[in-house]
């Protein structure tokens, strides 16, 4: 199947890659640069101009060009300047600023907590199944199976540290070799990048915002997939990661130190442990074929236990199993002996919500999954709203310049590497790459950070999470120290290798181009984002898993033709864009194939048919919510709520009313003015920090 043309061509000019993009003549020819292009490229784009005579906004003198959807929106100020405020206004403004900061930190806190709870929920829903994935004996011989198991388990438990710790315990107990563990670690690296992709989906309401957010999130996915694509075959052929890490581990005489620091968890744990607490050892025990663990609940009930070494009478199958001949007897039915056993006495129950409900893991998991996703979504929306109101004017300018500006000329190349260090440092502080990249996603969406800058930050995040793992390994007990350190180092060098592949030379920064391509498609066909998630994180890994279980012949038999077709399509795509004359006329484009094989338009029509019945009730509800939201936060009446309001949007566009979300609008005053709803800025609501 040929690729959809949108994927390969992430170019600055949207008309080059957007299907059926048409343009009407500008109203005022001399100022044709000013466009307010709607996201919906299916209908003619209305370009309009705000004539100075109608405008109350004095902030904008030159109309800005927004042709490139990847250009960051200018979040401009519509408030009264600080110098123009009276004492009361200044005090009010300071309190407003403090209030916003507290709210922002509060929502950020609950956002991080909800990610933690989401991880627990996934573990409750799929943790035991994930554990059973690991107990598959084929992992040893099949690196591809190891890779997909790493992906699937991490996706199911929503935590690479959980899957990594299972691998460590399996290596430590000789159930798995380091060689077999490396592909699993690579898979875990891929699996962990699903979290921020899910977070990006929460910004689906606004096309341009979603375009940036989704591309910013998937840049992580593409980096991981591409790294594996190159480094897994290299590792299978040379075992360089295994060899290098073994040399490092053997050259140091490590002494296991104290516990690794729990930086962010110190703040979030008190709250999350009131929601649910999990006994993560159960998943590891299942992975290690412990039959007793299969019936154990993951929900921790007893938090305070007393472990005592005592001589205990235990039954044995025969006299031969007795600890000593003198310590053996029968009660007429069973044979008993005395053994030194560690006896665990339950002292105090945990203090979380589910401790006394005795619900099955699946039920608790589903409840937490729904709640955490709702909280995650709510917090994200509020964070975006608060940031949108805070990041205006000079504040936005300062932040955007700080984050996105390069160093002066000879050292410009160093900026990206500093960003990598910042990403690593921040991830080390929050102790989770998922948390860091998920926090980054809305910032990319609202246009504070460019994708070009988010990319090295994400790469740094990958490094940061491995340094955390190395620290945790150094703090692990003697019996697991070697294996956990070697695996943590494998993870570290894998990410370093990936960075060396896909960062230093600008030309090799393929993940950015691929993410932008996907961002363009997803902005136009929003269903494709979910389609991408399902395909890349579930369908492909599960297919490979199934084929691997069927054996090498089946895997090769199916895999080779598929890989061959993909390579053929990519080569053809490359020739079509670079030197089409080399190709026969028929192959210079994809028109020789049925439309459904090279365009998403027919698929969109099919999906619209299926989702059609759900759109109207959703739309009514959405409009009500939208109006309430507009009343509360002063957004324009026609703000976009979701894809299901498309009919409304198109109707308004036909009347010349632009439909834009306030966050991506240059100026709130302008957006109101465009609808003939001009009002003077209210000193109570509009406030500039600088």
């Amino acid at each position: 199947m040929a690729p959809w043309p949108e994927l390969g061509d992430a170019q600055p000019n949207p008309s080059k890659y957007l299907e059926g993009a048409t343009s009407q003549q500008p109203i005022t020819p001399d100022k044709s640069k000013e466009t307010n292009k709607t996201d919906n490229t299916e209908v003619p784009v209305t370009k309009f101009e705000l004539l100075p005579t109608y405008s109350t906004a004095t902030l904008i003198e030159e109309p800005t060009e927004v042709d490139d959807p990847w250009n960051l929106p200018t979040l401009q100020d519509s408030g009264i300047k600080w110098s123009e405020r009276d004492a009361k206004g200044k005090i009010l403004c300071v309190f407003q600023g403090i209030g916003r900061l507290i709210l922002l930190l509060g929502f950020l806190y609950f956002f991080v907590c909800s990610l933690d709870v989401l991880s627990s929920a996934f573990q409750l829903v799929g943790g035991k199944m994930a554990g059973q994935f690991f107990s598959n004996s084929s992992i040893m011989s099949n690196p591809l199976l190891g890779l997909v198991i790493g992906v699937l388990v991490t996706v199911f438990v929503q935590s690479s540290s959980t899957s990594t710790s299972i691998v460590v315990s399996m290596v430590a107990s000789s159930l798995l070799t380091v060689r077999a563990a490396i592909p699993i670690i690579m898979g875990a690296n891929i699996g962990t990048s699903i979290t921020n992709t899910i977070v990006a989906l929460m910004q689906v309401g606004d096309r341009s915002e979603f375009r940036r957010a989704f591309a910013g999130a998937t840049v992580h996915d593409f980096f991981n997939w591409l790294s594996v694509l190159v480094l897994l075959p290299v590792e299978v052929a040379t075992h360089y990661l295994e060899v290098v890490t073994q040399l490092i581990v053997e050259s140091f005489h490590f002494k296991n130190g104290e516990d690794a620091p729990d930086l962010l968890k110190v703040i979030t744990k008190p709250f999350t442990k009131l929601i649910v607490q999990l006994d993560k050892k159960v998943i590891s025990q299942i992975a290690m074929n412990d039959e007793t663990a299969k019936n154990k609940s993951l929900v921790k009930i007893w938090c305070k236990t007393f472990t005592n070494m005592t001589q205990m009478n235990v039954t044995v199958p025969s006299m031969a199993n007795c600890t000593s001949p003198s310590l053996c007897w029968t009660d007429g039915i069973q044979i008993w002996t005395m053994k030194n056993v560690t006896y665990k006495e339950n002292i105090a129950k945990c203090q979380h919500i589910f401790v006394n409900f005795h619900l099955p893991d699946l039920a608790v998991g589903i409840i937490l999954l729904i709640i955490s996703l709702l909280v995650l979504c709510g917090c994200l929306i509020m964070i975006v709203k608060i940031l949108g109101s805070v990041l205006k004017g000079q504040v936005a300018t300062v932040i955007k310049k700080t984050i996105n500006t390069d160093f002066p000329f000879p050292f410009a190349w160093l900026t990206g590497y500093l960003a990598i260090l910042v990403g690593a440092g921040m991830t080390f502080i929050v102790q989770s790459s998922s948390v860091f990249t998920s926090a980054l996603t809305p910032l990319i969406g609202i246009g504070v950070i460019t994708i070009e800058r988010a990319y090295p930050l994400t790469l740094g995040s990958n490094i940061g999470t491995t340094t955390t793992a190395i620290l945790a390994a150094l703090a692990s007990p003697g019996n697991t120290l070697r294996s956990s350190l070697q695996i943590a180092l494998c993870h570290f060098f894998f990410n370093i290798s990936g960075i060396l592949l896909w960062y230093p030379i600008p030309f090799t920064r393929l993940p950015i181009r691929m993410a932008k391509g996907l961002g363009n498609i997803s902005a136009k066909y929003r269903w494709f984002a979910i389609f991408y998630l399902i395909i890349f994180f579930f369908l492909i890994p599960l297919t490979v898993f199934g084929l691997s279980l069927a054996g090498w012949p089946v895997l090769v038999g199916v895999g080779v033709p598929v890989v061959f077709i993909i390579i053929l399509v990519l080569c053809l795509r490359l020739l079509q864009s670079r030197c089409p004359r080399v190709l026969p006329k028929k192959l210079q484009n994809w028109n020789f194939l049925p439309l459904c094989m090279h365009s998403l338009k027919p698929w969109d029509a099919v999906i619209s048919k299926f989702t059609g019945p759900f759109q109207m009730p959703c739309c009514c509800c959405c409009r009500v919510c939208c109006r309430v939201c507009c009343l509360l936060c002063g957004c324009p009446k026609c703000c976009r709520c979701s894809k299901c309001c498309q009919d409304l949007e198109e109707g308004q566009e036909a009347q010349g009313v632009p439909v834009k979300a306030p966050e991506t609008f240059d100026n709130i005053t302008i957006s109101r003015e465009a609808q003939g709803e001009v009002r003077a800025p209210d000193s109570k609501t509009e406030c500039t920090a600088l």
């Epitope: 009478n313 053996c328 029968t330 008993w336």
Partner: antibody, heavy 120, light 107 residues
């Protein structure tokens, strides 16, 4: 206090069967094993078998296997011993005794005994 | 099955005398031996378990010793209420087996 109260004396015909009950009180029935021991007139003690009421696991002495059936009713904390195909040599006093499960203290409490007379 | 042989089968002695009853196992039973007292017309009562551990409420004049195959029950000072038949029992392996018994009488 700990009590094991057995059913009354039985006079039965050869070839028939007898069911002796042992009602317990004063302790957790499921935490113990109930053993059955018989004592023929002027003879020593002979172990018949035992049952773990908690899981109904039983064990019998070889020569009682197939003839003796041990059961336990957790709801009434009562153990039963049924002996079939009775012969004159089965005439004896049948005792039930408890043994603390997972412990080596032996049979620390006995019932008063049930006299079974096999006579035509 | 492990055979438990008790000796003597009966003994007659005076109040205050020291009484020793022995029990020999046909094979090594470690220390998995118990001693019971059965008074005429009554059910047996546990005296000693694990060869030498006195059961709750058993007077101190009763003591047990031995390991492997040879075991001893000692009554340091015979009392009139000690008139009974004494049985040893092994619980090293199944089936549980008892000794033939030793009848203790007072002259």
């Amino acid at each position: 206090q700990v009590q094991l109260v057995q059913s009354g004396a039985e006079v039965v015909k050869p070839g028939s069967s007898v069911k002796v009950s042992c009602k317990t009180s004063g302790f957790f029935f499921t935490e113990y094993i109930i053993h059955w021991v018989r004592q023929s007139p002027g003879q020593g003690l002979e172990w018949i078998g035992g049952i773990i009421p908690n899981n109904d696991v039983t064990n019998y002495k070889q020569n009682f296997r197939g003839r003796a059936t041990l059961t336990a009713d957790k709801s009434t904390s009562t153990a039963y011993m049924e002996l079939s195909s009775l012969r004159s040599e089965d005439t004896a006093v049948y005792y039930c005794a408890r043994w603390r499960n997972a412990y080596y203290s032996a049979m620390d409490s006995w019932g008063q005994g049930t006299t079974v007379t096999v006579s035509s | 099955d492990i055979q438990m042989t008790q000796s003597p089968s009966s003994l007659s002695t005076s109040v205050g005398d020291r009484v020793t009853i022995t029990c020999t196992a046909s094979q090594d039973v470690g220390t998995a031996v118990a001693w019971y007292q059965q008074k005429p017309g009554k059910s047996p009562k546990l005296l000693i378990y694990w060869a030498s551990t006195r059961h709750t409420g058993v007077p101190e004049r009763f003591s047990g010793s031995g390991s492997g195959t040879d075991f001893t029950l000692t009554i340091s000072s015979l009392q009139p209420e000690d008139v009974a038949t004494y049985f040893c029992q092994q619980y090293r392996t199944s089936p549980l087996t008892f000794g033939g018994g030793t009848k203790v009488e007072i002259k």
